[in-house]
Amino acid sequence: SSPTSSASSFSSSAPFLASAVSAQPPLPDQCPALCECSEAARTVKCVNRNLTEVPTDLPAYVRNLFLTGNQLAVLPAGAFARRPPLAELAALNLSGSRLDEVRAGAFEHLPSLRQLDLSHNPLADLSPFAFSGSNASVSAPSPLVELILNHIVPPEDERQNRSFEGMVVAALLAGRALQGLRRLELASNHFLYLPRDVLAQLPSLRHLDLSNNSLVSLTYVSFRNLTHLESLHLEDNALKVLHNGTLAELQGLPHIRVFLDNNPWVCDCHMADMVTWLKETEVVQGKDRLTCAYPEKMRNRVLLELNSADLDCDPILPPSLQTS
């Protein structure tokens, strides 16, 4: 017998699936070809099957959907819209599926979606309305609680002529839909900076992972509003020093643990306040592992072991006294 589908039309908001319906009565609990299903675990796994589209005949009971290791390329509007809707779908993993384009409304009609993992996809074209589903200034709140976007930066030759950081942040902030987001992972994305408004508009964050990026400074980033923040991962960036404003904000967060390993700390006179703070604070995990990278004479010195006499700056000579 031929396969059947339980998908159908949400005409205006999900044009892609308007035609995904079978001629036969739907069998909502059947398992799609090339997938493994466990009704008891409410789980469907369609993993490493070179799928080019999201299966149309997903069982209505699915709570956890793994579509990893495929070749999806593009997620159109309403890619998961079905009739009846996938009302139970809570965790969706699309990592490593060669997605380079996620369109507005791609995750619409998933009322219970709490965890979304798009990691390891070269997202050259992430719509600002990928998560909000609408271009309204204030959208309906997204149910998302965890958004995992590790290593979504495309190769340099595939990036568009715009800021990758800006594209991602636009999607995070559109319509203020992600006000309930508690975990955001943005590791390994070559971020050079963090746009200053992003954290202020994600007030529910408990966990923020910015590790393995290229962040040089946090000077313009405010953590003040993140009163629920419990973990902040900044390992493996290009941070040289944390300044007083940042230190005070971090110290003021009641539950915070900060991870700062493997940054190229510059141990000169500008580092004095940070060293003092490190010696007193309990918020930095593994603070005894932090070492200087520059200047050369300070390389590998442990920050906690430095004193003010170690932290000098070479005097800046007036131009007339500088030698070439």
């Epitope: 396969p3 044009p15 035609s19 799928l51 999201v54 149309t56 384009e101 074209d125």
Partner: antibody, heavy 120, light 111 residues
Framework: EVQLVESGGGLVQPGGSLRLSCAAS????????MHWVRQAPGKGLEWVAY????????YYADTVKGRFTISRDNAKNSLYLQMNSLRDEDTAVYYC?????????????WGQGTTVTVSS | DIVMTQTPLSLSVTPGQPASISCRAS??????????LHWYLQKPGQPPQLLIY???NLESGVPDRFSGSGSGTDFTLKISRVEAEDVGVYYC?????????FGQGTKLEIK
């Protein structure tokens, strides 16, 4: 050489049924999505239905939804279109066509077509 | 549904002369990653054949006198020097979303 050969067309009365087949050769059939496209006499091309390579995704034009069913048998390198409740306006040449994916794909190989005539 | 509108609906060209066919989509069929617009030629008594995919990519085996351009909603198919074997009906088609739709066709004749 890529070859697609349709069969199963013919004359059928309104309300009747017909099953079209498409035999594929010269390529790894199970790696490709497949479409049916039709062309009414003297008219342009109309997309009818799509099935993904592993039969995980199915899409239909509104004009045939609920009446036509697309299916495939990768072991037999064959594509099918079951057509029920046929109408006069279903009269057309039906082509099967190959694609590498639905949205990022295109119709890169076509069969010669099989003619379906719905008439009383 | 996305409506594809081709102009002109027919044209008659002297061999060796250029020809141009326009295709307009009722909404954008381009993203920054891909252009979802393709061109086909249906010669008399034959099935269609792919000429150009993703707006500007020449299908293997298609003569390089054919070229495609455009993005967003406006696309063009050009034949630099028309030959007798180019006669037939030319169709544009989008693959932005379901349903996939074709233009109404442009009939090319030789003068």
């Amino acid at each position: 050489e890529v070859q697609l050969v349709e069969s199963g067309g013919g004359l059928v009365q309104p309300g009747g049924s017909l099953r079209l087949s498409c035999a594929a050769s010269g390529f790894t059939f199970s790696n490709f999505g497949m479409h049916w496209v039709r062309q009414a006499p003297g008219k342009g091309l109309e997309w009818v239905a799509y099935i993904s390579s592993g039969s995980t995704s199915f899409y239909y034009a509104d004009t045939v939804k609920g009446r036509f069913t697309i299916s495939r048998d990768n072991a037999k390198n064959s594509l099918y279109l079951q057509m029920n409740s046929l109408r006069d306006e279903d009269t057309a040449v039906y082509y099967c066509s190959r694609t590498n994916s639905l949205l990022r794909g295109f119709f890169d190989a076509w069969g010669q077509g099989t003619t379906v005539t719905v008439s009383s | 549904d996305i409506v594809m509108t081709q102009t002109p609906l027919s044209l008659s060209v002297t061999p060796g002369q250029p020809a141009s066919i326009s295709c307009r989509a009722s909404q954008s069929v381009s993203s920054s990653s891909y252009t979802y617009l393709h061109w086909y030629l249906q010669k008399p008594g034959q099935p269609p054949q792919l000429l150009i995919y993703s707006a500007s990519n020449l299908e293997s085996g298609v003569p390089d006198r054919f070229s495609g351009s455009g993005s967003g909603t406006d696309f063009t198919l050009k034949i630099s020097r028309v030959e007798a074997e180019d006669v037939g009906v030319y169709y544009c088609q989008h693959s932005w979303e379901i349903p996939l739709t074709f233009g109404q066709g442009t009939k090319l004749e030789i003068k």
